[in-house]
């Protein structure tokens, strides 16, 4: 039902859902710190623009009695319970930040009259695509899918001269929330990825994956999986791998690959890692010093959510427009705003655009090197290394079908 918003007369409130079930196991205190840091920046920006207004955040905690799995499995009802709590207390702000779980975001969007914007650090699944008042500040599955299709089709790069049309996808059900939805999108028979590929099989057992590595009758040389190098090692170990196998390891929210002293282990030589371009200024931030790389991205998304709200608030106030209107609720898209770590671009559907980076392991230096970048905003690939020192024959990626390319 319609809830009155604390969002007028020079006082603007942000409702932050602090859910026990979260896309990343992040102490809520860290997210609070991120939000508070964002508020300080927003207040400064509004003051500099000559706007004398108050901006605050209200943190809404769930009781944690019923919904206590800690991951996203029991998040569906937790989000709705929190909304009910907000409704009963008549404490809705101008904008809702959180939830991060796809299940809860989807359900909340479905079951409420959303006349206010909703900003999510997560909600990766395809079911949260194209929602008119939802903004997602971490790369959703759709963006990954578009990269993969683009890369599969590409055949005019110095190091990739074959179009691919086949793939195995490894998905064993133990994935993190981001990986779960990324792989779910690749698995879905109605998805763009499935539609564009001629052959795709999901491997669900460790043994299935391990057998494919040396199976002469395999239907594809390409295997997509999601996780970090350690996850791959647990699965693959030091097993021999056919020389034309290419493993694509999706590890978007991990910038360890860019650290100076990192050496790629030997088991990564057949692997292309897909990650996001690293942030640079977060490392010195007060709220992020003790965070792992993944959690930095999660906390940063909360912080950027606050900055996004501040950006929109400033625009509407400068134009003398009302904040509690459908126009404001639908405005959080198709724009670029000043994020904590530089400009942040949102697409027409409110999803963050980013630069994905494909890395390979140099056989010369045993370092991760950038092969190409991909700009999700324009769906374009930019080759970076013209002569990669690959493990694959002729320093070119093999064909995806055994027997057609180098074997």
């Amino acid at each position: 039902s319609q809830v009155s918003q604390n969002c007028h007369n020079g006082s603007y409130e942000i409702s932050v859902l602090m859910m026990g079930n979260s896309a990343f196991a992040e102490p809520l205190k860290n997210l609070e710190d991120a939000v508070n840091e964002g508020l300080e920046i927003v207040r400064g920006r509004l003051q500099n623009a000559g706007l004398n207004v108050t901006v605050n955040a209200t943190f809404m905690y769930s009781d944690g009695l019923i919904h206590n799995s800690g991951d996203c499995r029991s998040s569906t009802c937790e989000g709705l319970d929190l909304l009910r709590k907000i409704s009963n207390a008549q404490r809705m702000g101008c904008v809702l930040i959180g939830p991060s779980c796809t299940y809860s975001t989807f359900q909340m969007y479905l079951d409420t009259e959303l006349s206010y914007p909703m900003i999510s650090a997560g909600s990766f699944g395809l079911s949260c695509d194209y929602k008119e008042t939802l903004t997602r500040l971490m790369s959703p599955a759709r963006k990954l899918m578009y990269f993969l299709v683009n890369f599969w089709k590409t055949n005019d790069l110095p190091f990739k001269t074959y179009s691919w049309s086949t793939s195995y996808v490894y998905k064993n059900g133990t994935e993190t929330e981001d990986c779960f939805w990324y792989l779910n999108a690749l698995e879905a028979s109605v998805s763009y990825f499935s539609h564009e590929l001629g052959f795709k099989v999901v491997l669900r057992q460790d043994k299935e994956f391990q057998d494919i590595l040396m199976d002469h009758n395999r239907k594809s040389n390409v295997i997509i999986m999601c996780g970090g190098p350690e996850f791959l090692y647990k699965l693959k170990g030091d097993r021999a791998v056919a020389e034309d196998i290419v493993i694509i390891l999706v590890d978007l929210f991990n910038d360890q690959y860019f650290e100076d002293n990192v050496t790629a282990p030997d088991y990564m030589k057949n692997v292309l890692v897909l990650t996001l371009s690293p942030g640079n200024s977060l490392l010195n931030s007060s709220f992020s010093r003790n965070l792992s790389p993944t959690k930095r991205d999660f906390a940063l998304a909360y912080l950027n959510g606050i900055l996004l709200f501040g950006h929109m608030l400033k625009i509407f106030l400068e134009n003398g427009e009302n904040i509690t209107t459908p126009k404001f609720a639908h405005a959080f898209r198709n724009l670029t705003f000043e994020g904590y770590d530089g400009p942040v671009t949102l697409d027409d559907w409110g999803d963050v655009d980013s630069t994905m980076v494909l890395l390979y392991t140099s056989v010369d230096t045993k370092k991760y090197k950038v092969l190409l970048t991909y700009d999700t905003h324009v769906n374009k690939t930019y080759p970076v290394d013209m002569s990669p020192t690959f493990t694959w024959k002729n320093s070119k990626l093999p064909n995806d079908i055994t027997g057609r390319g180098p074997q």
Partner: antibody
């Protein structure tokens, strides 16, 4: 539509350094490369190096290796080219340019004339 | 890396076609389909005319076309016009992931 804005001119003494800026207005530096190209009076174009701002990856022409440093500040969408140990033959117009595809520089700055003279 | 080799000058009458060559090695022109061509009028910044051997950016006349054979790339301008008079440069990537320009060709429209 992105434009690259450069300062008009710089006068430097031999042996000193120059740092030329290149600001993207109407857009960001994004994931593409920014190249630096120079042109001495009456001469051809000479590629000096490039940076991919979002990653900080640089490549330099062998001729300038050790003498040129290209950097970028993502937060201000500005790229910089610093050339050290200047000599009179470094007198040239220095252009920055964006390449959306390798070696395809589709947007150019207006150029900065650097004069090296004692 | 010294520049790619181009003829110093080329001329033609209005309405005619001319071709400018750009010769490199298998480590640059011959090795990659990343050859570009630029037009530069005196005192102005260069303008991209052709990229990736034969693609034209939007806004560039279809009188300009590009091709490549082995280690040599070519720019052809058909139906020459007075405003085509300018300097033309080719460029490409190298196996070191650097770029290199051609020596430049002065086009005179007679």
């Amino acid at each position: 539509e992105v434009q690259l804005v450069q300062p008009g001119a710089e006068v430097k003494k031999p042996g000193s350094s120059v740092k030329v800026s290149c600001k993207a207005s109407g857009g960001t530096l994004s994931s593409y490369a920014i190249s630096w190209v120079r042109q001495a009076p009456g001469q051809g174009l000479e590629w000096m190096g490039r940076i991919i701002p979002i990653l900080g990856i640089t490549n330099y022409a062998q001729k300038f290796q050790g003498r040129v440093t290209i950097t970028a500040d993502k937060s201000t969408s500005t790229a910089y080219m610093e050339l050290s140990s200047l000599r009179s033959e470094d007198t040239a117009v220095y252009f920055c340019a964006r390449d959306q595809r390798p070696a395809s520089m589709d947007v150019w700055g207006q150029g900065t004339l650097v004069t090296v003279s004692s | 890396q010294s520049g790619l080799t181009q003829p110093a000058s080329v001329s033609g009458s209005p309405g005619q076609s001319i071709t400018i060559s750009c010769t490199g090695t298998s480590s640059d022109v011959g090795g990659y389909n990343y050859v570009s061509w630029y037009q530069q009028h005196p005192g102005k910044a260069p303008k991209l005319m052709i990229y990736e051997v034969s693609n034209r950016p939007s806004g560039v006349s279809n009188r300009f076309s590009g091709s490549k054979s082995g280690n040599t790339a070519s720019l052809t301008i058909s139906g020459l016009q007075a405003e085509d008079e300018a300097d033309y440069y080719c460029s490409t990537v190298t196996s070191l992931s650097t770029y290199v320009f051609g020596t430049g060709t002065k086009l005179t429209v007679l």
